[in-house]
């Protein structure tokens, strides 16, 4: 998995008038890292992990960059011609990556009312847009504004390709991101489903990195994919992830089923609790 830094900026307009506030979220290696969600931006680390990465310093630099980018995006939204009455949003997502072989990738994507209409490869400076006429109109609108206003909106390009990578390298230097392996806590619960059946759910939480194998086995053999329901692997707000897998089994056969978990080279199996009690499995030994 490459290391990545992802900026997600959102600005809003109401009845054609651009609102003063904006929302900025920054993800480091897919984890919520920084956030600005007030009228007046103040970069806030998302959890202890983010604070550890940033170290003992103020986040003035991050605040300055995010505020500047928010202002630029508001100016861009103001130049979108076809704004109808009501609420509209313009979103810019910028991503840079450093791969294992040290190669880099950077891209920028614009969304209007949640719909992608313009993308740019920040290395090749190549623009792409969806085929729909609405997207093409919006794309031309925004591209023209960015070209015309390139001098005025220097800050718009400030945290792009080079600076995004510079920031990412700076964060990685802390070592916190590179070193981190946090094993999951796994717990198995049961609930009545229908007559003679129970649903067993296996939850893994608090793990990092996000790659995990979680599956149900009967007598040691994996159940087929279509007999299991998987939850997405989602950030849990603490710089770690959570997920779950569930399946339906016959009541009385609980002892035959185990939840198998594999993460960062470690593995464990977790039985179904015999009663309706929640059984907590600790970290692996």
């Amino acid at each position: 998995e490459p290391h990545s830094l992802r900026y997600n900026l959102t600005v809003l307009s109401w009845d054609g008038s651009v609102q003063s506030g904006f929302l900025t979220e920054v993800h480091l290696d897919g984890q919520p890292f920084l956030r600005c969600d007030r009228q007046k931006c103040r970069a806030k680390p998302q959890g202890q992990w983010a604070e550890d990465v940033l170290g003992n310093k103020t986040w003035d630099r991050e605040t300055r960059d995010l505020t500047g980018n928010g202002k630029d995006l508001r100016m861009t939204l103001a130049h979108i011609k076809d704004q109808k009455e009501g609420l509209h949003s313009l979103q810019e997502i910028r991503v840079c990556e450093i791969h294992e072989d040290n190669s880099t990738r950077s891209s920028q994507h614009f969304y209007y009312d949640g719909e992608l209409f313009l993308s740019q490869n920040l290395e090749t400076k190549e623009w792409t847009m969806p085929q729909s006429s609405r997207a093409q109109t919006l794309a031309m609108n925004v591209r023209n504004f960015l070209k015309e206003d390139a001098m005025k909106t220097k800050t718009h390009y400030h945290a792009m390709h080079a600076d995004c990578l510079q920031e990412l390298r700076r964060y990685l230097k802390s070592g916190v991101v590179l070193r981190r392996t946090v094993p999951p806590m796994v717990n198995v619960t049961r609930s009545e489903a229908s007559e003679g059946n129970i649903t067993v759910t296996c939850r893994a939480s608090g793990f990092y990195p996000w790659n995990i194998t979680l599956s149900w086995r009967q007598d040691g053999v994996s159940l087929s994919h279509d007999t299991q329901q998987w939850g997405d692997v989602l950030p849990d707000g603490n710089g770690t992830y959570q997920t779950w897998v569930a399946t339906r089994i016959c009541q009385g056969e609980e002892q035959r089923f185990t939840c198998y978990m594999e993460h960062s080279g470690n593995h464990s199996t977790h039985p179904v609790p015999s009663g309706k009690v929640l059984v907590l499995q600790s970290h692996w030994q």
Epitope: Q218, G220, V221, S222, L223, E253, Q255, E262
Partner: antibody, heavy 122, light 106 residues
Framework: EVQLVESGGGLVQSGGSLRLSCVAS????????MNWVRQAPGKGLEWISY????????YYADSVKGRFTISRDNAKKSLYLQMNSLRDEDTAVYYC???????????????WGQGTTVTVSS | DIQMTQSPSSLSASVGDRVTITCRAS??????LNWYQQKPGKAPKLLIY???SLQSGVPSRFSGSGSGTDFTLTISSLQPEDFATYYC????????FGGGTKVDIK
């Protein structure tokens, strides 16, 4: 006594079909996952198919996928293997085998039948 | 698919010898590994499950070890009835057997 007895083997032309049966006794078949395993003359064991107790998980070895179908009828205490488009290389002794239900099991086969011989000739 | 490689494919030993058979998986299979014994004209018999657990009724001279990709079946003191072919089998990803190890009299 816990026992598995296979039947249905015999001589069949290449491209032909055959249905093997395996009857269980001494235990409740419906509670167990079952398998078919074969052994070509002078060769090693080859797992070919698995079906779990609820028949909602079925696996096949690549060598038989699309040609063989595993099924079970718990009321008749029987496991089946429908073999179509038979080839010379399907010639083997076919065993049915039960997956152990012991706690901590890892898909081990604790009860085996005596085997039934299938010969495919071209 | 996971490949299971047994070595040696055959070995000659005497009664009382300590015999070791190895099984290597093409990728990590945790402890999802079982061992069987088969005598000519007979069905296989389960010896060890979960890499190291002895199946009920199997003599304690048989033992298994290993985890991940490398596994070992050991017969501490070979008895006359132990001359047979031994197979490993994995259930980590569907199911596959190793090629077998034939143990015959030296």
């Amino acid at each position: 006594e816990v026992q598995l007895v296979e039947s249905g083997g015999g001589l069949v032309q290449s491209g032909g079909s055959l249905r093997l049966s395996c009857v269980a006794s001494g235990f409740t078949l419906s509670s167990y996952s079952m398998n078919w395993v074969r052994q070509a003359p002078g060769k090693g064991l080859e797992w070919i198919s698995y079906i779990n107790s609820r028949s909602n998980t079925i696996y096949y070895a690549d060598s038989v996928k699309g040609r063989f179908t595993i099924s079970r009828d718990n009321a008749k205490k029987s496991l089946y293997l429908q073999m179509n488009s038979l080839r010379d290389e399907d010639t083997a002794v076919y065993y049915c085998a039960r997956v152990s239900s012991i706690t901590g099991n890892t898909g081990a086969f604790d009860v085996w039948g005596q085997g039934t011989t299938v010969t495919v000739s071209s | 698919d996971i490949q299971m490689t047994q070595s040696p494919s055959s070995l000659s030993a005497s009664v009382g010898d300590r015999v070791t058979i190895t099984c290597r998986a093409s990728q990590s299979i945790s402890s999802y590994l079982n061992w069987y014994q088969q005598k000519p004209g007979k069905a296989p018999k389960l010896l060890i499950y979960a890499a190291s657990s002895l199946q009920s009724g199997v003599p304690s001279r048989f033992s298994g070890s290993g985890s991940g990709t490398d596994f070992t079946l050991t017969i501490s003191s070979l008895q006359p009835e132990d001359f047979a072919t031994y197979y490993c089998q994995q259930s980590y990803s569907t199911l596959t057997f190793g090629g077998g190890t034939k143990v015959d009299i030296k």
